[in-house]
């Protein structure tokens, strides 16, 4: 019905306005109604005036160009004619009156379907229901993949691709690791994974100053060491270093008053040549104070050595020894002075002997026959040494004596001459310059090492070796080594260190193997004005040790892996040092500073003297400990 | 005996030289400096000039440089002093003196102590026209 | 060249007395001061060296104290024999140099 409609419609508009020229009221005849009516007529006008005023030719030229009046006049009430609707989007036209409505293909909107939907962005439908990619296409979308994902057959959700099996060798030496969409070649830790090589490579942190002081790369790692030789340990960060502080302060006053005998380990302390009148003699006061029992005092010679007077100590007593053209001769007497308080010594030639007081008292008388000195030039010509002696006297004595002694002396008056120019040169060398109060003991101030040949070797025992060592330690500062055991590889098959525990104001005692600790014993009381003492016994099976708290053998998986690393080095050649590390590598042990403090060690059951060491260090004290600083009142 | 004894003294014009020698016994030359030391009439000392051991050093009060100079001859344990271009104030008793190094330390470093123990009686030098 | 000064440049005093010479040096000369005596018509004599020892024979009552640029002699009780000039004289360093000399007379 609807047709039959529109074509009576076509067949009055033809006969109306085609065949003949309509005006408004007439073409409102043919539609019958205004809105159509409305629509036509303006573009019903268009056409005449293309078709009558001779436009046809430019008309042709538009888009909605028509042949002939007809069809142009024919085409306006056709909404859908020409085309509104968006060619790509729409699916249909329907015209309506004086209006249109154009149909849309899926995926597509708007009045004419110009509009593509977004299904991508569709909130009913979040990524378009894709799992990973939505792709927006006009009309349409599809959904994709990441790199490292297929799609499945739902052509919506995606599959990760594991590269590892698909490729095995992809990552060369380096450990595939497949991850979601990718794969990762992995390295342990400290290394880099190096794309060229296909290989992890060491990372070189200390190329990357990761330490403050010093660095030690190694495969997969890096340790940082601080210099322990100058005072620093490493701080509890592991990278930065901090001073090693003094943990019980000394008094470490001294005065120059008092001459230090100890000042040097090998050699004389003070020389001292006269040329005086030959109506002098020799004669030597004094005061003296020291804890050692055997060393030099002072030796005078004659200017040709063809006399000498040695005035010394052994076993605590003063004893002189005497060459000279009439006589040879050695005595000791008095009583034992080497207890630590100062003693007035004198020692005078007169005309027929040679007089020794202490504290004024007359111990020894020497006969001579002549004078001890032959004077030269009218002159008496004497050499005097502190401490010590010319070398190709030590052949020369009545009686070997070790030279060293760890004393001091004040109030000298030699030749009766004073002190006078020697006490200016002293008291511009610190270094000679006596502490003012001393203890019993020995002195390590932190800043070398003392060094002796033990042999180890126990014929008797099964065991082969042992190293049992006992020590009585009232340390200064937390951290040092107190005794190492050096091959001549440059390693340290065996040390025992101090370091300051991570609980505050307590110290551990280290047990190392090379740079492996073995046994750490944790937060004692060490840096007191009280002495502590410590034993530990050591062979190829077994590590025992005592402590103020505990006595116990130590065993544990790992200890007799390393005791057999320090039994081959036993086996071989090992050098002690006590108080700290000669020139090995930073690496070779746990801990590298000098132990600071006073120390006694005995080693398998004898008392190491310091003075008899192979070398030391000249600040180490072999017979004398700094007291305890006391706080007074106004300090 | 330890003696020195100075001779060669004189009167002499300005412009004119002299030569003192000085004799040493009871000692070996060879083993000490020697100094010379003058003392012009109602005057104080004033040191002239000394010579090493070996003779490789020698020094000189700044008034008598380029004038006088001090030789030895340990051979003969004689010590001299030429004295050229002399002048009125060069007149004074000269004394020969030993310097005996009295106090000699060795302490990280040498140091000696000097002092003038043996001495003449002076030799007089008078310069006039 | 170091200046070395003497005061007083005399003195007079009693046998018995206490007399005390002091000596300046024009920079530090360490403890390199020597003292000597001269008595009319003789040579001079060496009493101290190095400040404060005493040259051998030299009676114990002659003392010397000082280092740096200041320097004393004493005598502790002034006998007969100890009337003349003395004269300190410095050794540190060429030319050796003498103060002007102190006379110490009879009062």
């Known amino acids: 019905a609807n047709s039959l409609l529109e074509e009576t419609k076509q067949g009055n508009l033809e006969r109306e306005c085609i065949e003949e020229l309509c005006n408004k009221e007439e073409a409102r005849e043919v539609f019958e109604n205004d809105p159509e009516t409305d629509y036509f007529y303006p573009k019903y006008l268009v056409c005449l005036r293309s078709f009558q005023t001779g436009l046809f030719t430019a008309a042709r030229q538009s888009t909605n160009a028509y042949p002939d009046l007809r069809s142009c006049v024919n085409a306006i009430p056709d909404q859908c004619s020409p085309l509104p609707c968006n060619e790509d989007g729409y699916m249909s036209c329907k015209d309506g009156k004086a209006s249109f409505t154009c149909t849309c293909k899926p995926g597509w909107q708007g009045e004419k379907c110009e509009f593509d939907i977004n299904e991508c962005k569709d909130p009913s439908n979040i990524n378009g229901g894709c799992s990973q990619i939505c792709d927006n296409t006009p009309g349409s979308y599809h959904c994709s993949c990441k790199n490292g994902f297929v799609m499945l057959s739902n052509k919506k959700d995606c599959k990760d691709v594991d590269e590892c099996s698909l490729k095995p060798s992809i990552c060369g030496t380096a450990v595939c690791k497949n991850i979601p969409g990718d794969f990762e070649c992995e390295c342990p830790e400290g290394y880099r994974y190096n794309l060229k090589s296909k290989s992890c490579e060491d990372i070189d942190e200390c190329s990357e100053n990761m330490c403050a002081q010093l660095c030690v790369n190694y495969p997969g790692g890096y340790t940082c060491y601080c210099d322990g030789k100058k005072g620093f340990k490493l701080a509890q960060d592991q990278k930065s270093c901090e001073v090693v502080s003094v943990c019980l302060p000394l008094n470490l006053d001294t005065k120059y008053e008092l001459l230090y005998l100890a000042e040097q380990f090998a050699g004389v302390v003070l020389y001292l040549k006269f040329r005086l009148p030959e109506i002098s003699r020799f004669s030597a006061e004094f005061d003296f104070r020291t804890y050692d029992s055997e060393g030099v005092i002072l030796y005078a010679e004659s200017i040709d050595h063809s006399a000498w007077l040695l005035i010394a100590l052994r076993g605590g007593k003063i004893e002189v020894q005497l060459k000279n053209e009439h006589t040879s001769k050695i005595t000791t007497g008095g009583d034992v002075i080497n207890n630590g308080l100062w003693n007035m010594v004198s020692v005078e030639e007169l005309e027929h002997s040679i007089s020794i007081k202490i504290a004024k008292e007359a111990v020894m008388d020497i006969n001579k026959p002549g004078p001890l000195f032959k004077p030269e030039n009218g002159l008496l010509e004497t050499k005097v040494y502190f401490a010590g002696f010319p070398r190709k006297v030590e052949s020369e004595l009545i009686k070997p004596i070790n030279p060293r002694l760890d004393g001091c002396i004040r109030s000298w008056n030699l030749m009766k001459q004073g002190a006078s120019g020697i006490k200016e040169i002293i008291q511009e060398k610190q270094n000679k310059h006596c502490l003012v109060t001393v203890e019993k003991g020995s002195y390590y101030p932190g800043s070398g090492i003392a060094q002796f040949h033990i042999d180890y070797n126990n014929v008797s025992s099964a065991e082969g070796w042992h190293v049992n060592v006992t020590l009585n330690i009232r340390p200064s500062t937390g951290t040092g080594v107190m005794l190492a055991l050096v091959s001549g590889n440059n390693t340290v098959p065996f040390a025992v260190s101090l370091v300051d525990s991570t609980s505050e104001k307590s110290q551990d005692i280290l047990l190392s193997v090379e740079n492996t600790v073995i046994y750490r014993i944790q937060a004692l009381s060490l840096c007191s004005d009280q002495q502590s003492h410590l034993e530990f016994r050591v062979n190829r099976n077994n590590l025992e040790l005592s402590t103020p708290l505990k006595i116990e053998t130590i065993s544990h998986e790992d200890l007799q892996r390393q005791l057999a690393v320090l039994d081959k080095a036993m086996k071989a050649k090992v050098a002690t040092y006590l108080g700290g590390l000669p020139d090995v590598p930073f690496s070779a042990t746990p801990v590298n500073a000098f132990y600071n403090g006073c120390m006694e060690v005995n080693i398998n059951g004898v008392q190491l003297d310091l003075d008899e060491a192979i070398s030391k260090h000249n600040d180490i004290r072999a017979h004398s400990c700094p007291s305890v600083w006391k706080k007074t009142k106004n300090s | 005996e330890v003696q020195v004894v100075e001779s060669g003294g004189g009167l002499v014009q300005p412009g004119g030289s002299l030569r003192l020698s000085c004799a040493a016994s009871?000692?070996?030359?060879?083993?000490?400096?020697m100094s010379w030391v003058r003392q012009a009439p109602g005057k104080g000392l004033e040191w002239v000039a000394n010579?090493?051991?070996?003779?490789?050093?020698?020094y000189y009060v700044d008034s008598v440089k380029g004038r006088f100079t001090i030789s030895r001859d340990n051979a003969k344990n004689s010590l001299y002093l030429q004295m050229n271009g002399l002048r009125a104030e060069d007149t004074a008793l000269y004394y020969c003196?030993?310097?005996?190094?009295?106090?000699?330390?060795?302490?990280?470093?040498?140091?000696?102590?000097?002092?003038?123990?043996?001495w003449g009686q002076g030799t007089t030098v008078t310069v006039s026209a | 060249d170091i200046q070395m000064t003497q005061s007083p440049s005399s003195l007079s005093a009693s046998v018995r007395d206490r007399v005390t010479i002091n000596c300046r040096a024009s920079?530090?000369?360490?403890?390199?001061l020597n003292w000597y005596q001269q008595k009319p018509g003789k040579a001079p004599k060496l009493l101290i060296y190095?400040?404060?020892s005493l040259q051998g024979g030299v009676p114990s009552r002659f003392s010397g104290s000082g280092s740096g640029t200041d320097f004393t002699l004493t005598i502790s009780s002034l006998q007969p024999e100890d009337f003349a000039t003395y004269y300190c004289?410095?050794?540190?360093?060429?030319?050796?140099?003498f103060g002007q000399g102190t006379k110490v007379e009879i009062k």
């Open positions: 003196a030993r310097e005996t190094d009295i106090l000699t330390a060795y302490y990280s470093d040498y140091y000696s102590y000097y002092g003038m123990d043996v």
């Open positions: 009871g000692f070996t030359l060879n083993s000490f400096w």
């Open positions: 010579i090493k051991e070996d003779g490789s050093e020698k």
């Open positions: 920079q530090s000369i360490r403890s390199y």
């Open positions: 190095a400040a404060s």
């Open positions: 004289q410095q050794s540190y360093s060429t030319p050796r140099t």
